[in-house]
């Protein structure tokens, strides 16, 4: 699997999409996990609804949401209020039994907020809107990792 890079701005939302073949993965729940080290396990962050037909319903774990368009074949993960510690390598997975197929490897990069010096009075608070989705535009830039690029910096 090639690694796709998604870049987001600190404090904003990042939307990650993972396309797949809807028929090949028919009936399978999906998950978003974080890779612990280059060769380490992938730690589950959030998975889709237990009832597969309800996979289109957004499920949250903390600031991470997952929703699955099982007919169109697109898994979407939203990282809300992106923080520097969210940067790293992740996977979109398709689950079957105790096995998991990797749909896409994702490198999340967090860019500094260019407006970080703004007054506190300009800040937006989630409580000011009925729903986060209505109030906040999500930004994401994605690219494939170039050959030779490594998703993890060399450890000293």
């Amino acid at each position: 699997h090639n690694t796709t890079v998604f870049q987001g701005v600190a404090g904003q939302s990042l939307q990650v999409s993972c396309p797949y073949d809807s028929m090949k993965h028919w009936g399978r729940r999906k998950a978003w996990c974080r890779q612990l080290g280059e060769k380490g396990p992938c730690q589950r962050v959030v998975s889709t609804h237990n009832l597969w037909l309800l996979s289109f319903l957004r499920r949250w774990n903390g600031s991470t949401a997952i929703t699955d368009d099982t007919l169109g074949g697109t898994l979407t993960i939203t990282l809300r209020n992106l923080q520097p510690h969210d940067a790293g390598l992740y996977q979109c997975q398709s689950l079957h039994g105790s096995e998991a197929d990797t749909l896409r490897k994702v490198l999340v990069e967090v860019l500094a907020d260019p407006l970080d010096h703004r007054d506190a009075g300009d800040l937006w608070f989630p409580g000011e809107s009925e729903s986060f989705e209505d109030a906040h535009v999500e930004h994401s830039i994605s690219r494939s990792l170039l050959e030779g690029e490594i998703p993890f910096p060399p450890t000293s």
Epitope: M23, K24, G27, L53, T70, L71
Partner: antibody, heavy 119, light 107 residues
Amino acid sequence: QVQLVQSGAEVKKPGASVKVSCKASGYTFTGYHMSWVRQAPGQGLEWMGVINPVSGNTVYAQKFQGRVTMTRDTSISTAYMELSRLRSEDTAVYYCARIPSYTYAFDYWGQGTLVTVSS
Amino acid sequence: DIQMTQSPSSLSASVGDRVTITCRASQDISNYLAWYQQKPGKAPKLLIYRASSLQSGVPSRFSGSGSGTDFTLTISSLQPEDFATYYCQQHGHSPTTFGQGTKVEIK
């Protein structure tokens, strides 16, 4: 027992629309996706699209994109398929078919609805 | 789209015969293949899914095998009620597609 009962035969003029219904019984309607497949006289089977009965989300075969609309009414456990801008080549038997979650195969089928397009 | 090619397009057989129908996919579909039986004026009936899993209520004389691009439906001992048209369907890649059918006639 599982039953999918479709509406009766239709005769339509070219350019018109047709709406076929499929009433499900004997199982939980919102527990299975519903698909539509057609078969022209003496021909093979052709997949048209699928609907999630819970969300109403649909995916259509590219060939029918823009002409087909699949809907459902969960209160009466019924799925609908509407095909617009009919032409003579649309003369066929239209089937609704249930899809289980364990495999994308059609485990139960309606009896079929013959749609004849003729001027 | 993936093309499904069935052979033969028709065959004549007698009651008690062993009948084999093949289906070839234009690309690898793993084991994502189903078989249906259709009688004149009736809706298709699911026989086999995932290449070799027998659908509930289907007689054990029907069996399926194969993986990748080549698949087989076998009727071990043909019965009078088995004279029909048989279709294969791939469901490993969107959109799902069907073979053109194989008509099994009485010899």
